[in-house]
């Protein structure tokens, strides 16, 4: 730029560029003013007159310094599974984000295009990885000594309670039930006396697909990773 401050429109010196709030107009071959956020170029500059800017109309915006002939249209209204976290103004687009209990399955530059409900882990399964704004809940089977008796997108597997005397052993979907009486020789029918330290966890059986009165043998099966949908409900 020349020592004297240049006012738009001006011809840049050879090899120099326009200032940050200016653009080079190829037709006029001049540095011309950009329009501010919330405005657009109504009339482009000439050699003798600068850009004429005008405010964006309702439901349109420009977020940056620009020389676009028309403002951009704001996105459509947020859907029922979304909340509007930023309103459409002359300077910014509407931003929709997923409401609580949902996550963004398909994002866009700002906000979310498609929301989906967070997976709920069914009884016998707990949350291995919580849901975030952009990722679903991951469920895992409750490990021996832990359980989850809820259908939830937030509950983790919790340890079984520790019994001196176990009335009903815990499994993956149910806590252990302790006897209220102190250990005696004559034990209540069905009660299992565990001659172990108090800190020992109760017995545990893995969840099975179907309820069964037969003793569970699933603990004999290899415990590999479960398929993605296992342990989750569709609701």
């Amino acid at each position: 730029l020349p020592a004297q401050v240049a006012f738009t429109p001006y011809a840049p010196e050879p090899g120099s560029t326009c200032r940050l709030r200016e653009y080079y107009d190829q037709t006029a071959q001049m540095c011309c003013s950009k329009c501010s956020p919330g405005q657009h170029a109504k009339v482009f500059c000439t050699k003798t007159s600068d850009t004429v800017c005008d405010s964006c109309e309702d439901s349109t915006y420009t977020q940056l310094w620009n020389w676009v002939p028309e403002c951009l249209s704001c996105g459509s209204r947020c859907s029922s599974d979304q909340v509007e976290t930023q309103a459409c103004t002359r300077e910014q687009n509407r931003i929709c984000t997923c409401r609580p209990g949902w996550y963004c399955a398909l994002s866009k530059q700002e906000g979310c295009r498609l929301c989906a409900p967070l997976r709920k882990c069914r009884p016998g399964f707990g949350v291995a990885r919580p849901g975030t704004e952009t990722s679903d809940v991951v469920c895992k089977p409750c490990a021996p000594g832990t359980f989850s008796n809820t259908t939830s997108s937030t509950d983790i597997c919790r340890p079984h309670q520790i019994c001196n005397v176990v009335a009903i052993p815990g499994n993956a979907s149910m806590d252990a039930v302790c006897t209220s009486t102190s250990p005696t020789r004559s034990m209540a029918p069905g009660a299992v006396h565990l001659p172990q330290p108090v800190s020992t966890r109760s017995q545990h059986t893995q969840p099975t697909p179907e309820p069964s009165t037969a003793p569970s043998t699933s603990f004999l099966l290899p415990m590999g990773p479960s398929p993605p949908a296992e342990g989750s409900t569709g609701d």
Epitope: F7, R19, L64
Partner: antibody, heavy 118, light 110 residues
């Protein structure tokens, strides 16, 4: 080329006061003008701006308390109802652009002192 | 809002030393930042515009840098004449703002 402020004086609270920025050596046809103030011992505080199309913008705290207007050679700042907190030196400054968003100021006046006291 | 926060409020520097003044915007101002110098009883003087471009007649010991929300004014080889208060100013938006200027940094030269 210069800009010069005038009209600063001692006023009582609530008495409207108009300050004037007069330009010389250049035309007001291509530049926005801002008003900036500085309370004693404090920093610079932008009040507002007017461009050649008579479009204006104000700081949030200045809306309703100040009004900027212009002629071909002057820009006025009206303090609608001065309060003691408005005691300051008031500067006018030439913007290098003509938008109501200040770009940068290449020319400043020497300032005019306004004292609001009862 | 595009609030401008300047740090430190005061800085002491020896003659010949280097001083760095920081200016942080509450959101990106796309390098539309200017710096001014003001000495007691005087009008402000433009030093730098567009983050790093020196205004006419400003010594090269003044330099500016930064992007997004973080900007810096650096004075290397400080001279006694550099004792002043320095202000940053954003040139991005005037919508819903309290001040385009930062709070100022007083440079004391020892």
């Amino acid at each position: 080329q210069s800009v010069e402020e005038s009209g600063g004086r001692l006023v009582t609270p609530g008495t409207p006061l108009t300050l004037t920025c007069t330009v010389s050596g250049f035309s007001l046809s291509s530049n926005a003008i801002s008003w900036v103030r500085q309370a004693p011992g404090k920093g610079l505080e932008w009040i507002g701006i007017i461009n050649t199309y008579d479009n204006t913008a104000y700081a949030t705290w200045a809306k309703g308390r100040f009004s900027i207007s212009r002629t071909s050679t002057t820009v006025d700042l009206k303090i609608t109802s001065p309060a003691t907190k408005d005691t300051a030196t008031y500067f006018c400054a030439r913007d290098v652009h003509n938008n109501v968003v200040p770009y940068y100021f290449d020319m400043w006046g020497q300032g005019t002192l306004v004292t609001v006291s009862s | 809002a595009y609030d401008m926060t300047q740090t430190p409020a005061t800085v002491e520097v020896a003659v010949g030393g280097t001083v760095t003044i920081n200016c942080q915007a509450s959101q990106s101002i796309s390098n539309l930042l200017a710096w001014y110098q003001q000495k007691p009883g005087q009008r402000p003087k433009l030093l730098i515009y567009d983050t790093s471009d020196l205004a006419s007649g400003v010594p090269s010991r003044f330099s500016g840098s930064g992007s997004g929300t973080e900007y810096t004014l650096t004075i290397t080889g400080v001279e006694c004449a550099d004792a002043a208060t320095y202000y940053c100013q954003q040139g991005y938006s005037s919508s819903n703002i309290d001040n385009v200027f930062g709070g100022g940094t007083e440079v004391v030269v020892k």
